[in-house]
């Protein structure tokens, strides 16, 4: 017998979708071989309809796909917009269609149940609203209007124009009789329940002259939308529940083994601690729709998620919901990068951020996750160089090492920098990742003087001491600007007003400014790196003043206050100045650090080569 397994019989109705899961032994060969879905013809041949190599037959174009999950030993065939022509015998299999590694599947697509003539069909999701239209003749205009539900051979009164309301429909049903001349009455049922499903009968008048109209109400629990995302990546659940619940509290919950639904996040401020630092509920639009972003996906995040609306912020019967089944693919295209980066107070961290390597031109961003209420993520830095003012002189985003990774360096660390940060781009949103910065005990490895005052026209020498463990690293000094950190030329690159000389024996790298000019004022970083991978940095501020007889040696620059208006991560990312907008709600305005204009364009930079789950910054 074949080791491939799947559903032997699949039945559905026209217009529906099916998702057929086939199982195979997850050997190395099986995991990587071709997967296919084919239809058996009268001749016995099996014609491929869709395969894992990207082939889709013309009959299936735009309505079918095949997704392989090699780590689980499964693949899934999704087919939408079913018609009765899709009924037939199929095979799901591995390798070549004519070989034995396959499983027979029978698909039957029917028209749906037989209904009385002239029956109007209403198909509505649970929790939503239906309006049943009931026509009548002029002579029945003054007579009683009613809606009955057919249960077996009997009819149960649901509502009538004499103010009767069946207790099962209390507070969620109304009968509307229009003004004269309109020969139709309507019955509106809100917050539909699964139990409302069935055949209804509208009636106007009585006796042999009464008007009747059948209505078939199909209340559907929303079929979970299948969502396949990569381990370590990001998923966005877009939830549109309708205007009726625009002002009601919203939630996302996950169905547990007891078949209840645990709140993951809601607009009342509740959040599951398992999602700390990696979830945002984005503000809702006027139509009540909202989205939830989860980053740093883990295998244990798999499951069925529901979004909904209810004043309690949790699942209640008869309120609208939307459903997703999330699968997390362990054979991820998103590379491993540290989820925790450690630094010491006064020291620095260099964070590696992955992005889709096919999108090297995309704008890169780094934001600080804030957990208050629904969560938000104000942008701190972006690849175009705009930086929040309070990070002036200590934060830089570098395009290096490139090819799917950029680097963010943050120095002058304090305990307040501990927290969760998100790496993102204005491209593929699935590549959003989360990193946690932890501040640990210890001393910075690089030692520089406190802030320095230089005198115009004189020579300034700033030492940077480094320990032996960095002797094989490249050392550099650079001048920070809001567009990066411009490396200063070393002595052997020819004469320069600012040059670096290094005495390896004294484990010292010095910055010399000779002569000091007004343009030299600003932040300087001393750092170490290995190729394009950056290690620790230390920052020093150089203030420039006129020659005078007496004066203070050190100057501390005034720190800028926090920008009152700041850009905030929402469900999409856009370029500044409204170019290539994906989601116009992304940011509010932001005060940015003005570029001093004294730097050559571009920057050279890179990141720590650690590939473990924890990446160190400065350590003891």
């Amino acid at each position: 017998k074949s080791p491939v397994f799947g559903p032997q019989e699949v039945s559905s109705v026209e217009g529906n979708s099916v998702s057929i899961k086939c199982y195979y032994p997850p050997t190395s060969v099986n995991r990587h071989t071709r997967k296919y879905w084919c239809r058996k013809g009268a001749s016995g041949r099996c014609i491929t309809l869709v395969s894992s190599e990207g082939y889709v037959s013309s009959n299936y174009a735009g309505r079918a796909n095949l997704t392989n999950f090699p780590e689980n030993g499964t693949f899934v065939v999704n087919i939408a917009q079913l018609s009765r022509d899709d009924s037939g015998h199929y095979k799901c299999g591995l390798g070549i269609n004519s070989r034995g590694l396959s499983f027979d599947v029978s698909l039957e697509v029917s028209q749906g149940p037989e209904l009385p003539n002239g029956t109007e069909v209403y198909t509505v999701d649970v929790g939503r609203t239906v309006t049943i239209k009931c026509p009548f003749k002029t002579e029945n205009a003054p007579k009683t209007k009613a809606l009955y539900k057919k249960i077996g051979q009997t009819s149960v009164l649901v509502i009538d124009s004499r103010n009767y309301v069946n207790p099962n429909y209390k507070d969620r049903i109304r009968l509307r009789i229009p003004g004269t001349g309109q020969l139709i009455f309507t019955v509106v049922i809100d917050r539909l329940r699964l139990s409302d499903h069935g055949l209804y009968l509208c009636q106007a008048g009585d006796g042999s002259n009464r008007d009747e109209k059948n209505a078939d109400l199909q209340v559907l629990e929303p079929e979970p939308e299948l969502v396949y995302e990569d381990l370590r990546g990001s998923v966005t659940f877009h939830c549109a529940l309708g205007l009726e619940v625009a002002n009601v509290a919203k939630f996302l919950c996950r169905v547990n083994s007891r078949e209840t639904c645990d709140v993951v996040i809601n607009t009342l401020g509740k959040r599951d601690s398992a999602f700390e630092g990696r979830i945002l509920l984005n503000p809702q639009d006027k139509d009540g729709s909202f989205s939830v972003v989860i980053t740093g996906l883990r295998k244990e995040d798999e499951g069925r998620y529901l979004c909904g609306a209810h004043s309690d912020g949790q699942l209640q019967e008869g309120w609208p919901i939307q459903a997703w089944q999330l699968f997390v693919n362990e054979e991820s295209t998103i590379p491993r990068s540290p989820t925790v980066v450690k630094g010491v107070a006064g020291g620095s961290v260099a964070v590696l951020c992955p992005y889709n390597p096919k999108e090297s031109q995309s704008l890169k961003y780094w934001c600080l996750w804030e957990g208050a209420q629904n969560g938000r993520c104000p942008l701190l830095v972006e690849s175009q160089g705009l930086v929040q003012e309070q990070y002036e002189g200590r934060l830089s985003l570098l395009q290096e090492p490139g090819n799917g990774t950029f680097t963010v360096i943050l120095n002058q660390l304090t305990t307040q920098d501990a927290g969760f940060y998100w790496c993102l781009t204005n491209g593929d949103t699935r590549w959003r990742t989360t990193v946690e910065i932890k501040i640990i005990e210890g001393e910075p490895n690089l030692k520089v003087p406190g802030n320095v005052t230089a005198v115009l026209g004189e020579t300034l020498n700033i030492p940077c001491h480094f320990p032996c463990k960095f002797s094989s690293y490249e050392k550099y000094w650079c001048k920070w600007s809001n567009t990066g950190c411009q490396t200063l030329p070393s002595q052997d690159e020819g004469p320069s007003e600012a040059f670096v000389n290094c005495d390896e024996n004294s484990r010292l790298v010095s910055l010399t400014l000779n002569p000091v000019t007004r343009a030299d004022e600003g932040w300087y970083w001393c750092g170490v790196k290995q190729g394009h991978f950056y290690g620790e940095t230390a920052a020093v501020y150089v203030a420039v003043e006129e020659k005078k007889v007496a004066g203070s040696r050190y100057v501390s620059p005034a720190k800028a206050d926090a920008a009152p208006d700041e850009k905030v991560l929402d469900s999409g990312v856009r370029e500044i100045e409204n170019k290539a907008i994906q989601d116009p709600r992304l940011f509010a305005e932001e005060k940015v650090v003005a570029d001093t204009g004294d730097q050559a364009g571009g920057s050279r930079a890179s990141v720590d080569s650690s590939s473990s789950e924890e990446q160190g910054g400065s350590s003891k």
Epitope: E9, V10, S11, N16, V18, N72, G112, E221, P224, S257
Partner: nanobody, 126 residues
């Protein structure tokens, strides 16, 4: 919690038929997957058949050993799943268990199911 109660087991001759029922109650959320497993005397519990549904789409899975002889079906209105067993063989003798879950990764794996009935004995004599 979900309660599952099996019925319909008994003693029959080889070649006869039996129909097992599994009634589900107490659900707070729609169950999408219900299955039948069996445990022959002195052996491990094994997969027999599973039915899962989503809206008006139904998926039926069968073990090779029962294909063509057993049919799984459901009655939504009664919250009941049935196993129609035809052409019974002595090797079908076992305690038959009903199982249910919201989502299962592999319908053949007993550990994927969250709820189980007490079981009903089916004995097929030759």
């Amino acid at each position: 919690q979900v309660q599952l109660v099996e019925s319909g087991g008994g003693l029959v001759q080889a070649g006869d038929s039996l129909r097992l029922s599994c009634a589900a109650s107490g659900r707070t959320f729609t169950t999408y997957v219900m299955g039948w497993f069996r445990q022959p005397p002195g052996k491990e519990r094994e997969f027999v058949a599973t039915i899962s549904w989503s809206g008006s789409t139904t998926y039926k899975y069968y073990a090779d050993s029962v294909k063509g002889r057993f049919t799984i079906s459901r009655d939504n209105a009664k919250n009941t799943v049935y196993l129609q067993m035809n052409s019974l063989k002595p090797e079908d003798t076992a305690v038959y268990y009903c199982a249910a879950s919201t989502v299962v990764a592999d319908p053949r794996a007993p550990n994927e199911y969250d709820y189980w009935g007490q079981g009903t004995q089916v004995t097929v004599s030759s």
